[in-house]
Interface confidence: low
């Protein structure tokens, strides 16, 4: 598989540390929507890692939009994530385990798992691919680890793990990783996959900057963003080779990079774009 060959172009095995966002929508771009009102709102900017002001048109847009700076910080900054982590480590179910399954409003139905408070079990449901709530897990195991009781009636012991608030998965606690990588590829390689708003279902690939691999997704046929390639090879060519490992203050090791596009510098120890 050509993707696996590509995996060895980065000189060490160090994975890009995750960019931990409270909710996946914190990674959405500010969207003023099609209407023409002028409303001051706030959004979380993944590049500056701060909540910032923008002008909202009054309709549509996306969930990365908040009435106040405080609400934005509460939803999208790490402090709030740590509060959830504490409750998990205290062996209590996080509040979101008690939310009902929510498919969201999009149409790209994906198999996900949620904790059903009636049956006290994690169950499968179909997620639309956007919005929804945090009672939404990519695997049954993640759901069970976070929301189900253990055999003794207590929460499964997640000591030494941290709730990754982007996808509700468990990741090792000690993940303060130095900034080993710079990104010199196109900035759109860091954006999440975007189905777009039409109704076709085309096979495309996007670069998942979390895991450093090109992954298939279903494209609706219109809209979306530039992280959208017709083949895995094209995706890898455009995005994979943009990562450069920094080994010392001044020195850069190239990893078979073919493009020198715009220079987008990201400190990877704190931010992370969710595979959506």
């Amino acid at each position: 598989d050509s993707e696996e060959d590509e995996e060895h172009t980065i000189i060490t095995d160090t994975e890009l540390p995750p960019l931990k966002l409270m909710h996946s929508f914190c990674a959405f771009k500010a969207d003023d929507g099609p209407c023409k009102a002028i409303m001051k709102r706030f959004f979380f900017n993944i590049f500056t890692r701060q909540c910032e002001e923008f002008i909202y048109g009054g309709c549509e847009g996306n969930q990365n939009r908040f009435e106040s700076l405080e609400e934005c910080k509460k939803m999208c900054t790490r402090d709030n994530a740590n509060r959830i982590i504490k409750t998990t480590l205290q062996q209590e179910k996080p509040d979101f385990c008690f939310l009902e399954e929510d498919p969201g409003i999009c149409r790209g139905y994906i198999t996900r798992y949620f904790y059903n408070n009636q049956t006290k079990q994690c169950e499968r449901f179909k997620y639309g691919g956007c919005l929804g709530n945090m009672n939404n897990f990519e695997t049954l195991e993640e759901c069970k680890n976070i929301c189900e009781d253990g055999p003794n009636g207590f929460q499964v012991d997640n000591y030494g793990t941290q709730l990754n608030a982007v996808n509700n998965s468990l990741t090792p606690q000690s993940t303060k990783v130095p900034s080993l990588f710079e990104f010199h590829g196109p900035s759109w390689c860091l954006t999440p996959a975007d189905r777009g708003l039409c109704r076709a279902n085309e096979n495309r690939f996007y670069y998942n900057s979390v895991i450093g691999k090109c992954r298939p997704f279903k494209y609706s046929g219109c809209g979306g963003n530039e992280n959208n390639f017709t083949s895995k090879q094209e995706c890898l060519r455009a995005c994979k080779k943009g990562f450069i490992q920094r080994i010392s203050k001044g020195g850069l090791i190239k990893t078979k990079r073919k493009r020198k596009k715009q220079r987008v510098k990201i400190a990877y120890e704190e931010i992370f774009v969710k595979n959506m």
């Epitope: 969201g104 790209g108 179909k126």
Partner: antibody, heavy 117, light 106 residues
Framework: EVQLQQSGPELVKPGASMKISCKAS????????MNWVRQSHGKNLEWIGL????????TFNQKFKGKATLTVDKSSSTAYMELLSLTSEDSAVYYC??????????WGQGTTLTVSS | QIVLTQSPTIMSASPGERVTMTCSAS?????MHWYQQKPGSSPRLLIY???ILSSGVPVRFSGSGSGTSYSLTIRRMEAEDAATYYC?????????FGAGTKLELK
């Protein structure tokens, strides 16, 4: 237990319209899209389209645009398909089927439609 | 749209025999799904995502394949397996089914 209960067989005249119902139970109705599939001559299966009961969005096979209208009543967990301007070509068994954008996992028992003068 | 061609159209097998049927896609697809339909009944999901058995499906059934070529195998044919089997994709719009393979008991 997931169940999809469809309305009974129909005999209609060419040019008429008719509506098939599909009552869902045993799962969260708004959590899954409802697909509709046609089976002609007891053989070929053709996907007509789907409706997302959560927000009423529909997606159709181009072939059936203008032929079928999909609606839901969330309060009764019922999906409906109305077939318009019927001809003998539309005689078939019509299924509602719970599903996803990739496959369907539970099927109704089917509604037989006969279009004849 | 993607056309799915199933072969053979009709086949027969004796109890205990190994059965394999194929589904060929006109373009590459990510996953193939399989349904079983018996006369007078609705289709039933048998295998989804190429190889995952649906709930309650006996382990003698298996699915495999990738790209444009997929197959369904019954390790040891049983009388109750006599049915028509359909493959289905929705990697590309619209969702399409194969024309079916009718499996008869010899």
């Amino acid at each position: 237990e997931v169940q999809l209960q469809q309305s009974g067989p129909e005999l209609v005249k060419p040019g008429a319209s008719m509506k098939i119902s599909c009552k869902a139970s045993g799962y969260s109705f708004t959590g899954y899209p409802m697909n509709w599939v046609r089976q002609s001559h007891g053989k070929n299966l053709e996907w007509i389209g789907l409706i997302n009961p959560y927000n009423g969005d529909t997606t159709f096979n181009q072939k059936f645009k203008g032929k079928a209208t999909l609606t839901v009543d969330k309060s009764s967990s019922t999906a409906y398909m109305e077939l318009l301007s019927l001809t003998s070509e539309d005689s078939a068994v019509y299924y509602c089927a719970r599903g996803t954008y990739e496959y369907v996992d539970y099927w109704g028992q089917g509604t037989t439609l006969t279009v004849s003068s | 749209q993607i056309v799915l061609t199933q072969s053979p159209t009709i086949m027969s097998a004796s109890p205990g025999e190994r059965v394999t049927m194929t589904c060929s896609a006109s373009s590459s697809v990510f996953y193939m799904h399989w349904y079983q339909q018996k006369p007078g009944s609705s289709p039933r999901l048998l295998i989804y995502d190429t190889s995952i058995l649906s709930s309650g499906v006996p382990v003698r059934f298996s699915g495999s394949g990738s790209g444009t070529s997929y197959s369904l195998t019954i390790r040891r044919m049983e009388a109750e397996d006599a049915a028509t089997y359909y493959c289905q994709q929705w990697s590309s719009y619209p969702l399409t089914f194969g024309a079916g393979t009718k499996l008869e008991l010899k």
